[in-house]
């Protein structure tokens, strides 16, 4: 497919990028998926000003952002390099905490009802955002 | 565990339509998170995707831009099954044809194959 | 559209061998890349997604590795049973393959 100009029905354009928001919450491995469906990738925050545009959109809703660490090392799902990239934690976070009584720690990032991120168990039903960048995204309806 | 069967005739003559049809157990072709797949393999296109279709509230349809004015893939719920159709077939058609699952980040379970070849 | 290069069409090599194969994309494609193992008369089958995670059932001598456009695919100690053509992939594209043959 070829590139396109503009974003896919539904979709907000910002700065290049073509965002979705979910309105209904998945598991992060889901959500993930539900993106990579529709050609794109969990939102991956490289900067306050996308930061503040996302939280602009979500509200005071836990929402899954495209950043985990559950094969050792905090990643973003894009391959945005996590050690020198934004962040914007929450005080005391990420913690890992095993006290939920879940199974396991906290793996998945996501955004806090103030916007700042917390860690979280993987399989909790939060909303999460789709991105995908403008100049990659096909003529066609989601692709793989 | 998902498991793949395809069938449909090996042999079709130019200027015919193609029809294979990709017969799944294991999961239903109603899933709101896989996504059902044609490819095909030759020696002088290597591994190419040819088209998908996915249900999410309605179903979606996706085509490889060299095949996109004669490629029709159509899910069937009754059967549970999906299948390939391309139409006027050329010998450049001749391949080996697969389905496959499509779940987070690979094509995870393909058919057998079929060999099809375009002669007269 | 993204091309994925893989070179050397062909590589040679022993049983209990450690084989390094490559895909080179032709732009960014994150950690977005799966590996596929194809034997003569099959249909391929996954062994690694997302770059670096192993498809179930693949053995522990399989291993990929990379991020952004150069990618690598591992076999640790060559089995008999891997010399095989591999491809990678990413979303509908896939590279052209590189052959593992008995030295």
């Known amino acids: 497919g070829s590139e396109r100009t503009c974003c896919p029905v539904n979709w907000v354009e910002h700065e290049r990028s073509c965002y979705w928001f979910s309105r209904s919450g998945k598991a992060w491995a889901d959500a993930d998926n539900y993106c990579r469906l529709e050609d794109a990738h969990l939102v991956v925050v490289t900067s306050w000003e996308e930061q503040k545009f996302v939280q602009h959109h979500i509200g005071p809703v836990n929402t899954w952002m495209g950043l985990h660490d559950q094969n050792g090392p905090w990643k973003w799902v894009d391959g945005t390099d996590y050690e020198t990239g934004f962040k914007n934690w929450r005080p005391e976070q990420p913690d890992d905490w095993y006290g939920h009584g879940l199974g396991g720690g906290e793996d998945c990032a996501h955004f806090t009802d103030d916007g700042r991120w917390n860690d979280d168990v993987c399989q909790r039903p939060y909303r999460w955002v789709c991105e995908t960048e403008l100049d990659k995204a096909s003529q066609e309806p989601p692709l793989l | 565990q998902v498991q793949l069967q395809q069938s449909g005739p090996g042999l079709v003559k130019p200027s015919q339509t193609l029809s294979l049809t990709c017969a799944i157990s294991?999961?239903?072709?109603?899933?709101?998170?896989?996504?059902w797949n044609w490819m095909r393999q030759s020696p002088s296109r290597g591994l190419e995707w040819l088209g998908r279709?996915?249900?999410?509230?309605?179903?979606?349809?996706d085509y490889a831009v060299s095949v996109k004015s004669r490629i029709t893939i159509n899910p069937d719920t009754s059967k549970n099954q999906f299948s390939l159709q391309l139409n006027s077939v050329t010998p450049e058609d001749t391949a080996v044809y697969y389905c496959?699952?499509?779940?987070?980040?690979?094509?995870?379970?393909w058919g057998q194959g079929t060999m099809v070849t375009v002669s007269s | 559209d993204i091309q994925l290069t893989q070179s050397p069409a062909t590589l040679s090599f022993s049983p209990g061998e450690r084989a390094t194969l490559s895909c080179r994309a032709s732009?960014?494609?994150?950690?977005?890349l799966a590996w596929y193992q194809q034997r003569p008369g099959q249909a391929p089958r996954p062994l690694i997604y997302?770059?670096?995670n192993r498809a179930t059932g693949i053995p522990t001598r399989f291993s990929g590795s990379g991020s952004g456009t150069d990618f690598t695919l591992t076999i640790s100690s060559l089995e008999p049973e891997d010399f095989a053509t591999y491809y990678c992939?990413?979303?509908?594209?896939f590279g052209r393959g590189t052959k593992l043959e008995i030295k």
């Open positions: 294991g999961d239903s072709v109603s899933s709101n998170s896989v996504a």
């Open positions: 997302d770059a670096t």
């Open positions: 732009q960014s494609v994150g950690s977005y």
């Open positions: 496959a699952s499509w779940t987070r980040g690979a094509f995870d379970i």
């Open positions: 279709t996915y249900y999410r509230s309605k179903w979606y349809y």
């Open positions: 992939q990413h979303r509908r594209t």
